[in-house]
Amino acid sequence: PGPPAGSPRVSSDPRADLDSAVLLTRSLLADTRQLAAQMRDKFPADGDHSLDSLPTLAMSAGTLGSLQLPGVLTRLRVDLMSYLRHVQWLRRAGGPSLKTLEPELGALQARLERLLRRLQLLMSRLALPQAAPDQPVIPLGPPASAWGSIRAAHAILGGLHLTLDWAVRGLLLLKTRL
C-alpha cells in the first residue's frame, strides 16, 4: 500500500519535477525580461534603481559550487514570495502609468504564483520543510511620487530578473547532482 493519505508523496523521479520547475522558471524569466524591456522603453530608467524592501540576491558565481537543494528551494521560494508581494503592490499602488502595463503585470503575477505552487509541491515531494521567512514581512509603504513608483517598478523587475536567472542556473546545477 502507498503512503497514508495526507502525507507528502515522494516523487519517483525528482529530476522530472526539477525539470518542470526549471521550465516554469525559464518561462517567467522570459516574461520578466520582456516586461523590463517594455518598462525601459516606455519609462526610460536613469541609472540603476534599488528598493530596500527587496530581498538581497541569494546566489552568485562564487556560491554556485556549494549549493544544496533544500537551501536553494527554501530561499528561492521565500524570495519569490517577496517579489510576488511587490508585484501585487505595483499593480495596486503604482499609479496610472503602470496601469498601461496592467495585462502584462497581471500575467507576470499569475506566472509567479504558478511557479510558487510548483516549488511548494516540489518541496513537499522531496519531504523538505516549508520554511517560513526569517524576517517579519514589512508592509510596503505608499510610493512617494509617480516617478518613485516607476523607479520601484524598474528595481522590482530588475531584481526579479536577476533572481530568476540565478535560479535557473542553480536548479540546473542541482539536477546534475541528484
Epitope: 495596486r92 499602488a93 499609479g95 496610472p96 502609468s97 505608499p142 512617494a144 509617480a146 516617478w147 518613485g148
Partner: antibody
Framework: QVQLVESGGGVVQPGRSLRLSCAAS????????MHWVRQAPGKGLEWVAV????????FYADSVKGRFTISRDNSKNTLYLQMNSLRAEDTAVYYC??????????WGQGTLVTVSS | QSVLTQPPSASGTPGQRVTISCSGS????????VSWYQQLPGTAPKLLIY???LRPSGVPDRFSGSKSGTSASLAISGLRSEDEADYYC???????????FGGGTKLTVLG
C-alpha cells in the same frame, strides 16, 4: 509648501472652448501625476482626467473623452485642461490635484466654469 | 449615478462614533486602494484616508478607514461639530480606466 492654483475659469457659451491652467509650486512637479476633478454646483465630485508625470500617459472620463485634452509643461510647472465643445453639463468648479499613486494628496482651490447662453 | 455607493446622509451627536460605508465592485474597491476625502462647506476636498487605512499627517486619529472585499468604510469616533462636512470615497477602476468617486455622504452633527 505645496501649492496648486487654478485659473482660466469663467462664463462661456455652449459649443465654445476654454483652457484652464494650474500653476504648481513647493514640490518637484515633474515627479507627480496630476488630475483634474470637477464638482457641479450642489453635486458630488467627478473625476475628469489624469496625466502621468512624464506626460505620455493620459486617461479621461467617458463624459469628456474626445472634447477635453489634459497636458502639462514640466518646465513651467503648469498643468492644463483644454475644454472644447462645452456643454451646459460641464458647468462646475474645476480642481487640479496632485497624486503620488491613486489618491489626491493636495488640491487647488478650484476655478468656476459656467457654460451658459 | 455614482460607481461607488455611499449613503447620502449620516448623523450623530458630539462624542458619538459614526461609520460611513462605500460599496463598489471587483474592478475598483476589490482590486485597488480606497481613499477618503472631507469637504467642508465652500472649500476644496481634503485627503483623510489613503491606501485603505492610512492617515496623512495632521489628520486626527479619530478618523479611521477599513476595507473588506468590495466595500470600504470610514469611521469617525468622538464626533465633533467641526466634522460636519461632505465625505467622499474614491478608488481607481480597472474597467473604466479612471478614478471613481462615491456620491458623497453629508454628515450632520446634531445638538
Amino acid at each position: 509648501q505645496v501649492q496648486l492654483v487654478e485659473s482660466g475659469g469663467g462664463v462661456v457659451q455652449p459649443g465654445r472652448s476654454l483652457r484652464l491652467s494650474c500653476a504648481a509650486s513647493g514640490f518637484t512637479f515633474s515627479h507627480y501625476d496630476m488630475h483634474w476633478v470637477r464638482q457641479a454646483p450642489g453635486k458630488g465630485l467627478e473625476w475628469v482626467a489624469v496625466i502621468s508625470y512624464h506626460g505620455s500617459v493620459k486617461f479621461y472620463a467617458d463624459s469628456v473623452k474626445g472634447r477635453f485634452t489634459i497636458s502639462r509643461d514640466n518646465s513651467k510647472n503648469t498643468l492644463y485642461l483644454q475644454m472644447n465643445s462645452l456643454r451646459a453639463e460641464d458647468t462646475a468648479v474645476y480642481y487640479c490635484a496632485r497624486t503620488p499613486g491613486f489618491h489626491f494628496d493636495y488640491w487647488g482651490q478650484g476655478t468656476l466654469v459656467t457654460v451658459s447662453s | 449615478q455614482s460607481v461607488l455607493t455611499q449613503p447620502p446622509s449620516a448623523s450623530g451627536t458630539p462624542g458619538q462614533r459614526v461609520t460611513i460605508s462605500c460599496s463598489g465592485s471587483s474592478s475598483n474597491i476589490g482590486s485597488n486602494y480606497v481613499s477618503w476625502y472631507q469637504q467642508l462647506p465652500g472649500t476644496a476636498p481634503k485627503l483623510l484616508i489613503y491606501y485603505d487605512d492610512l492617515r496623512p499627517s495632521g489628520v486626527p486619529d479619530r478618523f479611521s478607514g477599513s476595507k473588506s472585499g468590495t466595500s470600504a468604510s470610514l469611521a469617525i469616533s468622538g464626533l465633533r461639530s467641526e466634522d460636519e462636512a461632505d465625505y467622499y470615497c474614491s478608488a481607481w477602476d480597472d474597467s473604466l480606466s479612471g478614478v471613481v468617486f462615491g456620491g458623497g455622504t453629508k454628515l450632520t452633527v446634531l445638538g
